[in-house]
């Protein structure tokens, strides 16, 4: 009752290894790292056989099969490349995840390299079995903005792709008679979120209550250049409208809001987010130059009364933009305090424009991003949102445009978007 000699399977071993095996002797068949015991098409870690009374083994020796991690999981906004020939997915094979450049980048500059582990799982040194995250790239237009810009009053036509974050927000309240329709601008922050001014999305009421417009009445256009031709643009409805809870309709303090889009928009050369600044109280430094784009009034001689009486006819067809310097806070406060009327330039606002006038943002540009190029990151950052201006016509002498200081609201914005600030941009101790 001696059993025949055993040959270990390829890439495997039998224990105990003996010259002879007799009745009741048991052996354990196991495989090398990266291989699994395969018996009757069932994978297992080990397999035991026994020498029977009649001198035969209780079972045939199983085979050792290389571990297969199978097809890796798909990455949203990402691609997979196989480093191993024939697109192998077996033990020690390597794959590399990358993001759809130039519109997405990998969070935390992860290598994206995953190796098929002995356990049959794709593993990354940092993330383990978790997939990487592709975040939208921000503040890098496919078309570089010219360094010198003529003086949306005193502005010039924007080329398509110059302001890929620019959104046109159309609000139409059909429940009212006559129909209420107005529009403003906004800035794309991610594939799903638009930043704008709260006054653009406040229901137009006669009292001072602040109630957001119904999300059903909001349409957002992205990648739009000429308002007469919306065919090339992406239009989206709103899933949520979020006004800053402390927006004050009387002095426009906290004039900031967000729109969550119904569906994430596909990013491309004409649709790309702008970057948010760091949380800081100073905001943009005086005399820094920023750019603002919008479809607002581009005729400096049009008064607010004329705009109201003529509806939307005075609006620009083609997206306009203008370059404006940030005005020292004290100078702006003084310029408004000297006017009749209850004007209040708070710490949550900054001003931009020229003392001599002629260049300004105007009605219909509301909510648009005042962007400044950050030399350090080489990206465009939204520092302001077009908020309000004096009673005189746009572009008047010593009437500066007033902008919401976005850097005061970064913590609030990230939280509304459901992203902890530290994930997206770790706070740097200064």
């Amino acid at each position: 009752n001696e059993c025949p000699e055993l040959q270990p399977p390829v890439h495997g071993k039998i224990e105990p290894s003996q010259a002879k095996y007799f009745f009741k002797d048991q052996v354990l068949v196991s495989c090398d790292t990266g291989y699994k015991v395969l018996k009757d098409n069932v994978e297992m870690d080990t397999f035991q056989i026994e020498c029977l009374k009649d001198g035969t083994w209780s079972n045939k020796i199983p085979t050792c099969k290389i571990v297969d991690c199978r097809a890796p999981g798909e990455l949203e906004h990402g691609l997979i490349t196989f480093s191993t020939r024939n697109n192998l997915t077996t033990y020690k094979s390597e794959i590399k995840y990358s993001c759809q450049e130039p519109y997405y980048k990998m969070l935390n500059n992860n290598t994206g390299i995953y190796t098929c582990s002995a356990q049959g799982v794709w593993m990354n040194k940092v993330l383990g079995r978790s997939l990487p995250t592709c975040l939208p790239e921000c503040g890098q237009p496919s078309r570089s903005l010219p360094s010198l810009v003529k003086r949306i009053i005193g502005g010039r036509n924007a080329e398509p792709g110059l302001f890929p974050w620019q959104a046109l927000i159309v609000v139409e309240d059909t429940s009212r008679v006559p129909n209420d329709k107005w529009f403003g601008s906004g800035a794309l922050l991610s594939a799903s979120w638009i930043l704008t001014a709260a006054h653009v999305l406040r229901s137009q009421r006669r009292d001072t209550t602040v109630i957001p417009v119904s999300k059903e009445h909001v349409t957002v256009y992205l990648g739009l250049h000429d308002v007469r031709d919306k065919s090339g643009a992406v239009n989206s409805s709103a899933a949520r409208v979020v006004l800053h809870p402390d927006f004050n309709i009387q002095n426009y303090n906290h004039d900031i809001a967000l729109v969550q889009l119904q569906e994430p928009v596909p990013l491309g050369p004409h649709v790309m987010p702008v970057c948010l600044p760091r949380l800081e109280p100073e905001g943009p430094a005086p005399h820094m130059l920023g750019l603002v784009a919008g479809w607002g009034i581009s005729n400096p001689n049009v008064t607010v009364d004329e705009i109201i009486s003529s509806g939307t006819r005075t609006l620009s067809d083609v997206l306009q933009y203008v370059k404006l310097p940030v005005v020292p806070h004290a100078e702006c406060k003084t310029s408004y305090e000297s006017r009749s009327g209850n004007y209040s330039v708070t710490e949550n606002m900054f001003c931009a424009g020229y003392y001599e006038g002629g260049k300004d943002t105007c009605l219909g540009d509301s909510g648009g991003a005042f962007v400044i190029f950050d030399d350090l990151s080489q990206r465009w950052v939204v520092q302001g949102l077009v908020s309000w201006g004096g009673p005189e016509e746009c572009g008047s002498k010593q009437v500066y445009g007033v902008y919401t200081k976005v850097s005061n609201y970064v913590d609030w914005v990230w939280e509304q978007m459901g992203l902890p600030q530290s994930v997206v941009e770790p706070q740097v101790e200064r």
């Epitope: 001072t208 602040v210 809870p245 402390d246 927006f247 004050n248 309709i249 009387q250 002095n251 303090n253 906290h254 949380l279 800081e280 109280p281 100073e282 949550n348 005061n408 609201y409 970064v410 913590d411 609030w412 939280e415 706070q427 101790e429 200064r430």
Partner: antibody
Framework: EVQLQQPGAELVKPGASVKMSCKAS????????ITWVKQRPGQGLEWIGD????????NYNEKFKSKATLTVDTSSSTAYMQLSSLTSEDSAVYYC?????????????WGQGTLVTVSS | DIVMTQSQKFMSTSVGDRVSITCKAS??????VAWYQQKPGQSPKLLIS???NRYTGVPDRFTGSGSGTDFTLTISNMQSEDVADYFC?????????FGAGTKLELK
Amino acid sequence: EVQLQQPGAELVKPGASVKMSCKASGYTFTSYWITWVKQRPGQGLEWIGDIYPGSGSTNYNEKFKSKATLTVDTSSSTAYMQLSSLTSEDSAVYYCARRRYYATAWFAYWGQGTLVTVSS
Amino acid sequence: DIVMTQSQKFMSTSVGDRVSITCKASQNVGTAVAWYQQKPGQSPKLLISSASNRYTGVPDRFTGSGSGTDFTLTISNMQSEDVADYFCQQYNSYPLTFGAGTKLELK
């Protein structure tokens, strides 16, 4: 978890000064204003002033301008308030507090308060 | 300075009652009002911000309302643990100011 730690009590003599601390943890200290509030026994709350640790900028209640000096030590994430020329009117509990959001001055996080007793 | 007036210094109530504490601002503060609860020997605890936004973890029996100059904190179903001082605060402009407080006690 955001925490503000303050010493429990300080006993000081009239005419002297006291410097109380507020040690912050659980967040980036330099990103949020720290506010100081006074409460006399059985009385309401009075805003003294606030300080932005990132730059050292301060805002004071006019009433406390010559009484309180606000400072920070960013290396230890600690805010300080010094009260000078103390009288019995300064006997109170002093709280430090932190805003929830940078731009809105309501206070979600409070220290336990330091009881200052001015007595000879 | 903006004066916040809480006209009721004391309010006596019973468990299960609906209680409304009022606060009046001397000028328009929009919705920039917060409400705090303070129990003896403890620091104030935020209940409401932006006049009506209940803070995380605050029971839904606490409701804030109002805008402009008139604000109300309502406790819809008074509980024994709600016995405390309640303060309103405006943060529309500096200097930040608090109401004198309303002491809520059980009958």
